[in-house]
């Protein structure tokens, strides 16, 4: 549902940054008493290479409404879209474009979601239907990920700009995306 919504009409671009919908105060528990001291996942390095300066992976901000069937979020959410060729920066154009100015002969690096955050959203539905609450996954950061030919042909089917799930605006969750992002879809949608 959500992915189809993203693909079809949930990518409405809105000029201003919208507020994040907040859950009722009673659900905003003080979590300090029951958090794991070291339970957070370690941050991932943005690039899988020693020479970070050689690669370029851009994070574009998009503001959109989340949709689920006929229902739409009460407020827009802002998320990242990963863009860039992950090639040597000096060979990449300044402007983001579809053209491939640089093509690696060796391993293929792609700019894909690295970490995700969850955000609560309230979905308003037509016809007087009751509002819905959802947690949508949103991209929090991008990275250059080394992909093998096997990854490109096989495991990359499942994910597209779906790379959005839910979280609010505290610490973004480090979610290494494994070799699961369908780059063809990513390039088309992003």
């Amino acid at each position: 549902q959500g992915w189809q919504a993203f693909k079809n009409d949930a990518t409405e671009i809105i000029p201003e940054l919208g507020e994040y919908p907040e859950p009722p105060p009673e659900l905003e528990n003080n979590k300090t008493m029951n958090r794991a001291e070291n339970g957070g996942r370690p941050p991932h390095h943005p690039f899988e290479t020693k020479d970070v300066s050689e690669y370029s992976c851009r994070e574009l901000h998009f503001t959109r409404y989340v949709t689920d069937g006929q229902c739409r979020s009460a407020k827009p959410v802002t998320e990242l879209v990963c863009s860039g060729q992950c090639g040597p920066a000096r060979l990449l154009p300044n402007a983001i474009g579809r053209g491939k100015w640089w093509r690696p002969s060796g391993p293929d690096f792609r700019c894909i979601p690295d970490r995700y955050r969850a955000q609560r959203v309230q979905l308003l539905c037509p016809g007087g239907a009751a509002p819905r609450a959802r947690k949508v996954r949103l991209v929090a950061s991008c990275k250059c990920k080394r992909l093998t030919r096997f990854h490109n042909q096989s495991e990359l089917k499942d994910f597209g700009p779906e790379a959005a799930r839910p979280q609010k605006g505290r610490k973004p969750r480090p979610r290494a995306r494994g070799a699961k992002a369908n780059q063809a879809e990513l390039e088309n949608a992003y």
Epitope: Q1, R35, A36, R120, R170
Partner: antibody, heavy 121, light 109 residues
Amino acid sequence: EVQLVQSGAEVKKPGASVKVSCKVSGYTLTELSMHWVRQAPGKGLEWMGGFDPEAGETIYAQKFQGRVTMTEDTSTDTAYMELSSLRSEDTAVYYCATDGELYWYKFFQHWGQGTLVTVSS
Amino acid sequence: QAVVTQEPSLTVSPGGTVTLTCGSSTGAVTIWHYPYWFQQKPGQAPRTLISDTNDKHSWTPARFSGSLLGGKAALTLSGAQPEDEAEYYCLLDYGGSFVFGGGTKLTVL
């Protein structure tokens, strides 16, 4: 499709620790929000803790705070739940459970087969 | 910590309709508790039926539906089948901490 395979049954003495593993396939572990739930014989389900994608941290139920540790080995896509200072009342089946949707967070969609931990002197 | 309450047991006739409820000691259950419903049969792991109040999963039979009724989460079974005899648990999300209800033993008889 997410699949979770847990380690085998364990018998422990009071005061000891147990470490239950949960191997993920179909997704990488870092894509998922893993939770642990236990069920004592003839009793109901009890949430022990899990990864909260809003906080970006693992959160433990107050009852188990200080006695449980949930960790992940992302190189093998295996989650672990370690419970220390075991007592007889910790005898239970321990389940790992995770989400598995691409777009919405819907926790507890996929469950491991369960690991029976027996605490007996 | 919050306490989540369910009916300990309910009985329904084959083909009949029954509603299981799930209340919270902190007040009314709302959509922001993201109510979950699970079915568990003896010797098996739980199976998720409903997420986020009323979202069914691909494996959830159409006869199950979730809603909010009178400040509680509700699971309605319309047209009960013998195979629906099981234990049913609700689960509420309290801002990242979860609490299960005590379970409802549903008998189809």
